[in-house]
């Protein structure tokens, strides 16, 4: 025998009150699937969370942050506030990137600057707490009668700071 | 029930203060940090200032920083907002909001209705 929630669609939930019917979701609850016995609560963007998507009948709403939080976890369960460039977060809030260390985005850790010399390159650009280092060519490349000047190589695996 | 109540809202002239309270109950006040947020007309919701558990203040609002301050008062399971220097774009409704921690909320974080603050010029 066919269990007749099954042609219950998404939506709807198969009310045992009433012989089995199939009823529309409440307001503010959804089933995104067909069959359900029950719908769900829809979440509730609230405070710092913002909606992104409203709840329907058959999908639950979605949240994402308002400006100056950024998303964590799964379908965003979390809120994590941003820090400036040139900081990073610890558990007393933002603070700067130490001296030799540098985070380019408004989360994240600060990274120390690249070692060019571990490259055998000269650095060609100071770090800054915004900014990795730009290394140069190597002290080779720079001595007369070198040909060509070898362009910047793209920032490695972070070193140590410069000397 | 846990609950989150806003008070102290209202009409107030350019330059003037207020103190904005959230009185908390139903849960351990002393655990939580205590975070204000305002939505103005027409705009998105923004963080103005927090309180850790332990008492330290987090600006989320370079704007308010030299007006508004943050205090709680664990007896009083109460947070106050301290506004002075009001400005017109201060014109918003101020909610609180429960977090673990002033850098982390999350989606079952605890949250007030809100007070509205008017500041006309």
């Known amino acids: 025998l066919q269990d007749p929630c099954s042609n219950c669609p998404a939506g709807t939930f198969c009310d045992n009150n009433r012989n089995q019917i199939c009823s529309p979701c409440p307001p503010n609850s959804f089933s995104s699937a067909g069959g359900q016995r029950t719908c769900d609560i829809c979440r509730q963007c609230k405070g710092v969370f913002r909606t992104r998507k409203e709840c329907s009948s058959t999908s639950n709403a979605e949240c994402d942050c308002t400006p100056g939080f950024h998303c964590l976890g799964a379908g965003c369960s979390m809120c994590e506030q941003d820090c400036k460039q040139g900081q990073e977060l610890t558990k007393k809030g933002c603070k700067d990137c130490c001296f030799g260390t540098f985070n380019d985005q408004k989360r994240g850790i600060c990274r120390p600057w690249t070692n060019c010399s571990l490259d055998g390159k000269s650095v060609l650009v100071n770090g800054t707490k915004e900014r990795d280092v730009v290394c140069g060519p190597s002290p080779a490349d720079l001595s007369p009668g070198a040909s060509s000047v070898t362009p910047p190589a793209p920032a490695r695996e972070p070193g140590h700071s410069p000397q | 029930q846990v609950q989150l109540q806003e008070s102290g809202g209202g009409l107030v002239q350019v330059g003037g203060s207020l103190r904005l309270s959230c009185a908390a109950s139903g849960f351990t006040f002393d655990d939580y940090a205590i975070g204000w947020f305002r939505q103005a007309p027409g705009k998105e919701r923004e963080g103005v200032l927090c309180i850790s558990s332990s008492g330290g203040s987090t600006y989320y609002a370079d704007s308010v920083k030299g007006r508004f301050t943050i205090s709680r008062d664990n007896a009083k399971n109460t947070v106050y907002l301290q506004m002075t220097n009001l400005k017109p774009e201060d014109t918003a409704v101020y909610l609180c909001?429960?977090?673990?921690?002033?850098?982390?909320?999350?989606?079952?974080?605890?949250w007030g209705q809100g007070t509205q603050v008017t500041v006309s010029s």
């Open positions: 909001g429960a977090p673990r921690d002033c850098s982390r909320y999350s989606s079952d974080d605890y």
